[in-house]
């Protein structure tokens, strides 16, 4: 068997919300995903599971089963949404997310992913790990890879 | 430690402008909204603007529009703010402020304020 | 633009009184990302202003727990539970969810 590689692209877009009173952050991010089939038979992407953290914080968790069947040779693009919460010991970061004199409220976060495939019968894992900004002061959709993490305004990590 | 200095005092003609400056040490102004506020003698404090410096965007209340310009150099880290054909409604105190972040909270920072006083 | 009204002008208190300051908005002053960005400013003579409360309530790093602000829409309040002389001066609200942002008129904290 050849290789299956996946590719994490980066962050498509985070979709902000706040609860007030609990001074609470709820972050909806979608990642994107490319999976390609090096192999002259299909594949079946079973699941995807992801993990957000922050501050060394797990902040959210996503899994996707039964995802898709990638041809020979071919290749797709996956996106998966995973919903985080920044809360309790990390409210502090409410009030740098809502602070309006700020321009851009980059928090850093890394992301992690397993993706689960399977040919006949066998199974395989591939995880990979990035570190991405996001801005957790509105609701933003980036171009592919603009969303990797370079030098960025943000709170002690 | 972050700090707005402002520049000194100014006693200027009227009709005439002066510019007033707004140095921040500490943080880097490109990252912030910086927002200038006029005192008028035993009077209260009024919103004029806010700049955005890296891009020199900016939003004035109504009625300092055309009297106050607000303008940046982010390679200087400075904030301005002019002010043109002086007349005795100018007069007072001009305060340049921001909030930026330090670790885990937020911190107010005003500047000293820079008096202007307008007489012939 | 949101005008911002504050009542009383003056107060005269004794130490040690309770104080209440009021500030009612034009407007609803909800930012579209839900927070109310309502603030509470003291100003000394010669001073430039100080944050006591942001965001309706929350007390801003290092401002005494004698100082507390509640509210909502258009109506707040600033309590100053037991008046010190360190807070006298001119009590400033201020709203940042709308632009131009706005100050009140200013209400004087002083001595009986």
């Known amino acids: 068997p050849r290789s299956i590689d996946v590719k994490y692209i980066g962050v498509k877009s985070a979709y902000v919300s706040y609860d007030v009173q609990k001074r609470t952050i709820y972050l909806n991010i979608t990642n994107t995903l490319n999976i390609t089939n090096n192999n002259y038979y299909s594949v079946e992407v079973e699941n995807i599971t992801a993990q957000v953290q922050f501050s060394k914080t797990v902040i959210g968790k996503a899994r996707l089963n039964n995802i898709t069947i990638i041809g020979p040779l071919d290749m797709k693009q996956i996106d998966y949404t995973v919903p985080t919460v920044i809360a309790e010991e990390m409210s502090y970061m409410y009030d740098f997310c809502t602070l309006i004199s700020i321009k851009v409220h980059n928090i850093v976060l890394m992301m992690q992913v397993t993706v689960t495939t399977t040919y006949f019968g066998h199974s395989e894992q591939i995880s990979q790990e990035r570190y991405q900004y996001v801005d957790c002061g509105r609701n933003t959709t980036y171009q592919l890879g603009q969303s990797e993490y370079l030098n960025v305004l943000q709170p002690q990590q | 430690e972050v700090q707005l200095q402002q520049s000194g005092a100014e006693l200027v003609r009227p009709g005439a402008s002066v510019r007033l400056s707004c140095i921040a040490s500490?943080?880097?102004?490109?990252?912030?909204?910086m927002y200038w506020v006029k005192q008028r003698p035993e009077q209260g404090l009024e919103w004029i603007g806010r700049?955005?410096?890296?891009?020199?965007?900016?939003e004035y209340v109504p009625k300092f529009q055309g009297k106050a310009t607000m303008t940046a150099d982010t390679s200087s880290n400075t904030a301005y703010l002019q002010l043109s054909s002086l007349t005795s409604e100018d007069i007072g105190v001009y305060y340049c402020?921001?909030?930026?972040?330090?670790?885990?909270?937020?911190?107010?920072?005003w500047g000293q304020g820079t008096s202007v006083t307008v007489s012939s | 633009d949101v005008l911002m009204t504050q009542t009383p002008l003056s107060l005269p208190v004794s130490l040690g009184d309770q104080a209440s300051i009021s500030c009612r908005s034009s407007?609803?002053?909800?930012?579209?990302?839900?927070?109310?960005?309502l603030e509470w400013y003291l100003q000394k003579p010669g001073q430039s202003p100080k944050l006591l409360i942001d965001?309706?309530?929350n007390r801003f790093s290092g401002v005494p727990d004698r100082f507390s602000g509640s509210g909502s829409g258009t109506d707040f309040t600033l309590k100053i539970s037991r008046v010190e002389a360190e807070d006298l001066g001119i009590y400033y609200c201020?709203?940042?969810?709308?632009?131009?942002?706005?100050f009140g008129s200013g209400t004087k904290l002083e001595i009986k």
């Open positions: 500490g943080f880097n102004i490109k990252d912030y909204y």
């Open positions: 402020t921001t909030r930026t972040w330090d670790l885990y909270y937020a911190v107010d920072n």
């Open positions: 201020f709203q940042g969810s709308h632009v131009p942002f706005t």
């Open positions: 700049i955005d410096p890296e891009d020199g965007d900016t």
């Open positions: 407007q609803n002053i909800v930012h579209s990302n839900g927070n109310t960005y």
């Open positions: 965001k309706v309530s």
